[in-house]
Structures are given as structure tokens and as C-alpha cells.
């Protein structure tokens, strides 16, 4: 997260760290007791690593009573995701067992009504992604509030030049932005999950390159079919 600040510890109990071989790779969001939603591209570089999900964490390194690492039983990428586009960039991870819920571990309701969030709405994005262009990684969860940007502006030739589909949304990126390592994490508007950070190699913090988020409401049928 660029231009953000440290989050209040455990105030986002839905927040997940998707890890490979014990290292944070991407964000994720607990959407059901046994399921974490993330971005499909996240695991492309997981190769043959051990994929696990950390729940109940604020610090990645320090012991915390609520922290627990879960093995992944199943990784279900969206069937239309592919390596060279950010379309359909969603991944569902089934935990090896139901998460132990509590004040620091709780699923987040996700948007089912397929309607665009009003431009200008302030939404919260959180993650353990880099906090500087130099690539510094935080140990503790960071967050930032970002205004939603209308799709027409986001699709301008000077911005994303028509790449933003109806199934994506944008948020402003003027020095405050999600960045490498935040992919798969939640964009939360009014206490509801609206978007998932896409995992392209976009430049961060440049206002001409807004943050791109996959709209979960557009994938309600797929999410329901996997969780069923």
C-alpha cells in the first residue's frame, strides 16, 4: 500500500495473507468459513511451492494469539483467467478446515448486486504489499482510503486505454494506491467487499494509471457455484 498507514490491529478480521513457502505473496479475503478469495495471477509464480493462508494476523512476523496458518485443500482459479490478461482475475482457495472464527477472524459480506459503485465513494484497501517504490515490505497490515474512479475516465487513452471492462472497477492512484503484494486483497466500500485487487504489473501511485479491481458482484454466480 502506497501512501497509506498502519491499520488498526485486527480491525479487518476478513484479511488474509496468501503465502508460498512461508512468505507473503498476495492478499486475500475470507468470504466463507472455509474459503478465501484472492487473485488468480497470484499463484502463477507459486510454481511447486506450498500454498497456505494466514488468518487473524496483523504482524506477519510476530506471534499473535489470533494468528493461524491454514493449508490449502483446493485452489480454484476462475475458468476464464489466463496469464496474459487481467480479465477474470479471481481465485478461490479452500482451506484444509473451517477457520476458527472470532473477533479477529470473520468472513466479509460480499456484494451480490451487479451495480457500479458510485464514483467518488471512498473505499478501503488493505494489504501487506510494498509501501515504497524502493520495494520496502511492511511487517504490519497497511490500509488506505481511495475514491472510486468512473470507468470512462479510467478507460481514457492516457489512462488504461479501454482495457477496463464492465467486470472491473477503478480507484484513484494519486500517490495513494495498492501495489505489488496487495494483489488479491479486498476493496471494501461501506463494509461490503466490492473489489479484489488485480495482479497485473501496473505502475503504482501514478494518477494516470488508476488501480484496477475485479468487481465481485459480476462473479456472484461463479463464487456461489464453487462455494456450494
Amino acid at each position: 500500500i502506497l501512501g497509506g498507514r498502519e491499520a488498526e490491529a485486527h480491525a479487518r478480521p476478513y484479511m488474509a495473507s496468501v503465502q508460498v513457502n512461508g512468505e507473503h505473496l498476495c492478499g486475500g479475503v475470507l468470504v466463507a468459513e472455509q474459503w478465501v478469495l484472492s487473485a488468480a495471477h497470484c499463484l502463477e509464480d507459486a510454481a511447486d511451492g506450498k500454498v497456505q493462508v494466514l488468518l487473524g494476523a496483523h504482524s506477519l512476523s510476530q506471534p499473535e494469539p489470533s494468528k493461524r496458518l491454514y493449508d490449502v485443500l483446493r485452489a480454484v482459479p476462475h475458468p476464464d483467467s489466463r496469464p496474459d490478461t487481467i480479465d477474470h482475475d479471481l481465485l478461490l482457495l479452500q482451506l484444509s478446515e473451517k477457520a476458527t472464527l472470532g473477533p479477529a477472524v470473520r468472513p466479509l459480506p460480499w456484494q451480490r448486486v451487479d451495480r457500479d459503485v458510485e464514483p467518488g465513494t471512498l473505499c478501503d484497501v488493505a494489504g501487506w504489499g510494498i509501501v515504497s517504490h524502493a520495494g520496502r515490505r511492511p511487517d504490519r497490515l497497511q490500509h488506505v482510503l481511495l475514491p472510486v474512479l468512473d470507468r470512462a475516465t479510467c478507460n481514457r487513452r492516457t489512462h488504461h486505454d479501454g482495457a477496463i471492462t464492465q467486470r472491473m472497477m477503478c480507484a484513484e492512484s494519486n500517490r495513494r494506491d495498492s501495489c505489488k503484494g496487495d494483489s488479491g486483497g479486498p476493496l471494501v466500500c461501506g463494509g461490503v467487499l466490492e473489489g479484489v485487487v488485480t495482479s497485473g504489473s501496473r505502475v503504482c501511485g501514478n494518477r494516470k494509471k488508476p488501480g484496477i479491481y475485479t468487481r465481485v458482484a459480476s462473479y456472484a454466480a461463479w463464487i456461489d457455484s464453487v462455494l456450494a
Epitope: 508460498v20 513457502n21 488468480a40 502463477e44 510454481a47 511447486d48 506450498k50 483446493r74 480454484v76 475458468p79
Partner: antibody, heavy 120, light 112 residues
């Protein structure tokens, strides 16, 4: 640039041995599973062996046709994968490819191959 | 072992025409993780094979959208909507759901 370069092929007599090597570069070798796939002259592709990464205990898997004769191994410090072939048979004559194994897909990067000829 | 049977063995196609290759597995190739690891590879003359399609229908990086994969259970199809000269070669289906992994026998695409 992601690259796999095989070496060690050659002519060997039946019941002989040969060790193939594959040098990997341009990617984090230690996190990937690696495979050997072969192709007999004028024939189709046949998967031979797979070795997983350290996080999966370097588990190995083999085709029935080579089990107990071939051994796949790796050296993560040198980004190398090997195929030790013992008790070779004429039907092992083939082009041997070293192949990287992805997460969502299997064989995403192939070497150019090394030729093994088993003949008396 | 899972036997992968490809048809036809050889397919003469005119440039610009559609080509369709079938692949049938001797048993279901749905993996225990729920995914179906059915892939298609193209080997051009004198070259190493290249991945075209993974998980039945997903095009790999740089693969033109004239290539499409479909199917489920034990029956799978690769379609090339408009045959181009660069598409010539041998196409192989592959299953990675059950060890030992197995390839189909190959289908040679030729110009009619």
C-alpha cells in the same frame, strides 16, 4: 530470459548407463517442479519423470516404462536437474527434453532436447 | 494408466478453414483438487513442443484466440477457427490429473 539447456546425450550400448543434465536459468529454479519428457524418432511425446521442489520434499514420480531404471534428481544451488539412466534398452532411444512444471499448467518451458541412442 | 486417444491421426486442412481435433481419455481426468488438467501442445517441425491450452479451455500466454479448447469428463476438443500456415505441426493432448501423466498419440495438421 527463461531457459533450459540439456546435455549428456550420446550413443550407449544396451544395458549401459548415461546421465543427462539440464541447466536452468532466468527463473527461481528452486520453487519449480521439473520433468523429463522424451520422444522416440518419428513418434509421439512420452512423460518420463518429475521431481518436486524442496517444499514438497523433492518427491519423485516415474513412468512405468522407466521405473527402477531411471532416477531424477536436482541440485537447487546450481539450478540443475539430472536424469540418471541405467540398464538402458533400445526402446529408450529418443530425444530427451527437460521441462518446467507450472502451477496452473504443466509444461510451460521446454529445452531444445538432447539425443540418446541405445544401440549395439 | 490413463490412455489418451486422439483422432484423427492426420488432418488435411485448407488455409482459412476450421480444424477440429478430438481427444478421449480412458477414464475421468478430474483431479482430486477439482480441476481438470487437460492440456494441448503444438510441436512444429524441428522444434520443441509449446503449450497452447491448459485446464481444458484456457489459452496460454501469446496463443492467438483462433485456438479454443472445450470438453469435460472424458471427451475434449481443440478447435482452430481459421487455419494459418504457422499452425502446421503435430498437436498433442495431455492429462496431468493422474500419475503417470500421459499424452495422446498426436494429430498431424497438414495443408490440403
Amino acid at each position: 530470459e527463461v531457459q533450459l539447456v540439456e546435455s549428456g546425450g550420446g550413443l550407449v550400448q544396451p544395458k549401459g548407463s548415461l546421465k543427462l543434465s539440464c541447466a536452468a536459468s532466468g527463473f527461481s529454479f528452486n520453487t519449480y517442479a521439473m520433468n523429463w519428457v522424451r520422444q522416440a524418432p518419428g513418434k509421439g511425446l512420452e512423460w518420463v519423470a518429475r521431481i518436486r521442489s524442496k517444499s514438497n520434499n523433492y518427491a519423485t514420480y516415474y513412468a512405468d516404462s522407466v521405473k527402477d531404471r531411471f532416477t531424477i534428481s536436482r541440485d537447487d544451488s546450481e539450478s540443475m536437474v539430472y536424469l540418471q539412466m541405467n540398464n538402458l534398452k533400445t526402446e529408450d532411444t529418443a530425444m530427451y527434453y527437460c521441462v518446467r512444471h507450472g502451477y496452473y499448467w504443466y509444461f510451460d518451458v521446454w529445452g531444445t532436447g538432447t539425443t540418446v541412442t541405445v544401440s549395439s | 494408466d490413463v490412455l489418451m486417444t486422439q483422432t484423427p491421426l492426420s488432418l488435411p486442412v485448407s488455409l482459412g478453414d476450421q480444424a477440429s481435433i478430438s481427444c478421449r481419455s480412458s477414464q475421468s481426468i478430474v483431479h482430486s483438487d477439482g480441476n481438470t488438467y487437460l492440456e494441448w501442445y503444438l510441436q512444429k517441425p524441428g522444434q520443441s513442443p509449446k503449450l497452447l491450452i491448459y485446464r481444458v479451455s484456457n489459452r496460454f500466454s501469446g496463443v492467438p484466440d483462433r485456438f479454443s479448447g472445450s470438453g469435460s469428463g472424458t471427451d475434449f476438443t481443440l478447435k482452430i477457427s481459421r487455419m494459418e500456415a504457422e499452425d502446421l505441426g503435430v498437436y498433442y493432448c495431455f492429462q496431468g490429473s493422474h500419475v503417470p501423466y500421459t499424452f495422446g498419440g498426436g494429430t498431424k495438421l497438414e495443408i490440403k
